[in-house]
């Protein structure tokens, strides 16, 4: 068992039929000796009296709000949590598994350039009774400061049948140097509280494996005389580092009618300018990419071709 | 030989299009490593992440974009930077940064040269012959030194007496490609930058 | 799958003109755009120009401009090249090729020789 | 227009060896490069498009690479199969053009 926050603690058991379960004991919060009474959650049944309580935990029903109190008054409260492992494996149920670009990805992270700040999000079904705190560091063994925010509902999808919810939240290191050549990962750690289970979730990169830059920004066309062929230009985005000739981007150009399907003109080039042939009803894109060091690409931005 | 100066003279394209050569040979060979060293930990989540420059070079620093000296964090994250001297910061006499810059990263070729030579002699000794060094990357590596035009004391290759644990030099081998290949990226941002301004 | 069928050789006097033809099957004609490519012997390819046949747009390379003339007829799924005032230099296997792609060759066509000469 | 260069002309190499061949561009033309192999009387087939990509059905013995002016394709391991014809070609800008070629032969 350990420490969550004040009051809230964690029961770590092994989940398998018939598991003895772990033997606690709670100690109630007062200098008061005698006359003290033991209750879990809003029950009134009288679960055991004195300073401290002794309890086998062995499934949900075990854990809860344990209250003690005397003549009436409530003493003080603690919260016990459940952190289930089965086969040696703690549970994952609270989140779901993105796939993306692993299999066991719970956690997802991209940050638009190199100052430091990223956005981490995960998806759960879970609508109720959910509570997320984040913290994250650069390094495990002497780590430097991540500063995190709070999680945030960040969208709401309908899957099929179900309902799936995203949350973010957005960390910024407290002392980066956007130059600088990354030794040490960046630890990030996720508590999840469904009810009374508990899950814990990490993800460990480098900023310059997740970066995805905005789209390309001010996409314009130019015509050329008689020709087919139209000169698109773009500008880098604002949210990118700078200086640009240091912090370079390479882009890719295509032209493409509505469908995944059609047919296409494709161009790739460091300048911010291109030529490309304009097909009436398709559209020009526009994505971006680190020159140097390949992560991932940007989102598209698009203008039609008419 | 001179100190290169700070003039945007097409002196400075030769460095950089020899710094693209070097980013893609360096890449190429890690990938190569990756795809032949498959059952040893070759990826960047599995190796340790090292830098047999630190504390010897300072290329980060002394390289720094002027538009990123007024960031505190890049200014402090190594105790031998270049340019913490107030005098040189605030004056930024360009030439003589870029002398120290390019001498810099002179340095970081040399000591990799050094290094991927004497683990190219140890893999030509493994029976397996499983993996070498892209000759194409060792020459890429060469022409950018040429190119930088410094005088230096050669560095000995080292040599070892004892067996060499194979599996070990692999192993390493990863370590260094990983390393070298950030610092190529930083090299070409440098060059690139440089080129611009 | 995509395939690409040319007519046969000929065989053309200076001075005349030539046109080629280049049946697709296995795939939507008007999905692809399609290209002429040719090759004199012993030497190497030579891209002569495009056509998008579901507009008949083109663009034909500045050395054959005027002289060449890409078709197509949906109907029967079948592009043209037509090449006018034939020189002995001209003298060359002619491929058509397909692509989804506007900018590189991915089906070819088997060829067509075309010899010029008096 | 810009001028596509291959080199060598021609390179000769026994079975099982690695080949090693180049193209350059007049002008910078980033990864807008594709690689094509051609037999005697046969058409070109494409092996690499984008400086890079592989294409299904293409064994992983041949591995592109380069960007800006310098491009090469890699033969890891030559089978009797891959002696022929290898051709760049860039497609940055129209006219589209290719290199004179690089032909590989039974040392």
């Known amino acids: 068992i350990w420490e969550l926050k004040k009051d809230v603690y964690v029961v770590e058991l092994d989940w398998y039929p018939d598991a003895p379960g772990e033997m606690v004991v709670l100690t109630c919060d007062t200098p008061e000796e005698d006359g003290i009474t033991w209750t879990l959650d809003q029950s009134s049944e009288v679960l055991g009296s004195g300073k401290t309580l002794t309890i086998q935990v062995k499934e949900f029903g075990d854990a809860g709000q344990y209250t003690c109190h005397k003549g009436g008054e409530v003493l003080s409260h603690s919260l016990l949590l459940l952190h289930k492992k089965e086969d040696g494996i703690w549970s994952t149920d609270i989140l779901k598994d993105q796939k993306e670009p692993k299999n066991k990805t719970f956690l997802r992270c991209e940050a638009k350039n190199y100052s430091g700040r990223f956005t981490c999000w995960w998806l759960t079904t879970i609508s109720t009774d959910l509570t997320f705190s984040v913290k994250s560091s650069r390094g495990s063994s002497d780590p430097q400061g991540v500063t995190c925010g709070a999680a945030t509902l960040s969208a709401e999808r309908v899957r099929g049948d179900n309902k799936e919810y995203e949350y973010s939240v957005e960390c910024q290191e407290d002392s980066a140097c956007p130059a600088a050549e990354e030794s040490l990962p960046i630890e990030v750690m996720v508590d999840a509280v469904h009810k009374l289970k508990y899950e814990n979730y990490t993800s460990s990169f480098f900023i310059r494996d997740i970066i995805k830059p905005d789209p390309p920004k001010n996409l314009q066309l130019k015509p050329l005389k008689n020709s087919r062929q139209v000169e698109v230009s773009w500008e880098y985005p604002d949210t990118w580092s700078t200086p640009h000739s240091y912090f370079s981007l390479t882009f890719c150009v295509q032209v493409q009618g509505k469908s995944k399907r059609e047919k296409k003109d494709r161009v790739f080039t460091d300048k911010t300018s291109a030529t490309v042939i304009c097909r009436k009803n398709a559209s020009i894109s526009v994505r971006a990419q680190d020159r140097y060091y390949s992560s991932s690409w940007s989102e598209w931005a698009s203008v039609p071709c008419s | 030989r001179n100190l290169p100066v700070a003039t945007p003279d097409p002196g400075m394209f030769p460095c950089l299009h020899h710094s693209q050569n070097l980013l893609r040979a360096v890449s190429n060979m890690l990938q190569k490593a990756r795809q032949t060293l498959e059952f040893y930990p070759c990826t960047s989540e599995e190796i340790d992440h090292e830098d047999i420059t630190k504390d010897k070079t300072s290329t980060v620093e002394a390289c720094l974009p002027l538009e990123l000296t007024k960031n505190e964090s890049c200014l402090n994250s190594r105790e031998t930077s270049f340019i913490t001297n107030g005098s040189c910061l605030a004056s930024r006499k360009t030439s003589f940064m870029m002398a120290l810059c390019l001498s810099s990263i002179y340095e970081d070729l040399k000591m990799y040269q050094v290094e991927f030579k004497t683990m190219n002699a140890k893999l030509l000794m493994d029976p397996k012959r499983q993996i070498f060094l892209d000759q194409n990357m060792l020459a890429v590596i060469d022409e950018l030194m040429q190119a930088l035009n410094f005088n230096s004391e050669t560095v000995p290759q080292k040599s070892s007496l004892e067996e060499p644990d194979f599996y070990k030099t692999k192993i390493k081998l990863c370590i260094l490609l990983h390393a070298f290949r950030i610092r190529a990226v930083t090299i070409d941002r440098v060059m690139s930058y440089l080129n611009a301004s | 799958q995509v395939q690409l069928v040319q007519s046969g050789a000929e065989v053309k006097k200076p001075g005349a003109s030539v046109k080629v033809s280049c049946k697709a099957s296995?795939?939507?004609?008007?999905?692809?755009?399609l290209h002429w490519v040719r090759q004199a012997p012993g030497q190497g390819l030579e891209w002569m120009g495009w056509?998008?046949?579901?507009?008949?747009?083109?663009e034909y390379a500045p050395k054959f401009q005027g002289r060449v003339t890409m078709t197509t007829d949906t109907s029967t799924s079948t592009a043209y090249m037509e090449l006018r005032s034939l020189r002995s230099d001209d003298t060359a296997v002619y491929y058509c090729n397909a692509n989804k792609e506007l900018r590189y060759f991915d089906v070819w066509g088997q060829g067509t020789m075309v010899t010029v000469s008096s | 227009e810009i001028v596509m260069t291959q080199s060598p002309a021609t390179l000769s190499v026994s079975p099982g060896e690695r080949a090693t061949l180049s193209c350059r561009a007049s002008?910078?033309?980033?990864?807008?490069l594709h690689w094509y192999q051609q037999k005697p009387g046969q058409a070109p087939r494409l092996l690499i498009y984008?400086?890079?990509q592989s294409i299904s059905g293409i064994p992983a013995r041949f591995f592109g690479s380069g960007s800006g002016t310098e491009f090469t394709l890699t033969i890891s391991s030559l089978q009797s199969e891959d002696f022929a014809v290898y051709y760049c070609q860039q497609s940055n800008s129209f006219p589209l053009t290719f290199g004179g070629g690089t032909k590989v032969e039974i040392k």
């Open positions: 056509i998008d046949p579901e507009n008949g747009d083109t």
């Open positions: 002008q910078s033309i980033s990864i807008n």
């Open positions: 984008f400086a890079s």
């Open positions: 296995g795939y939507a004609f008007t999905d692809y755009y």
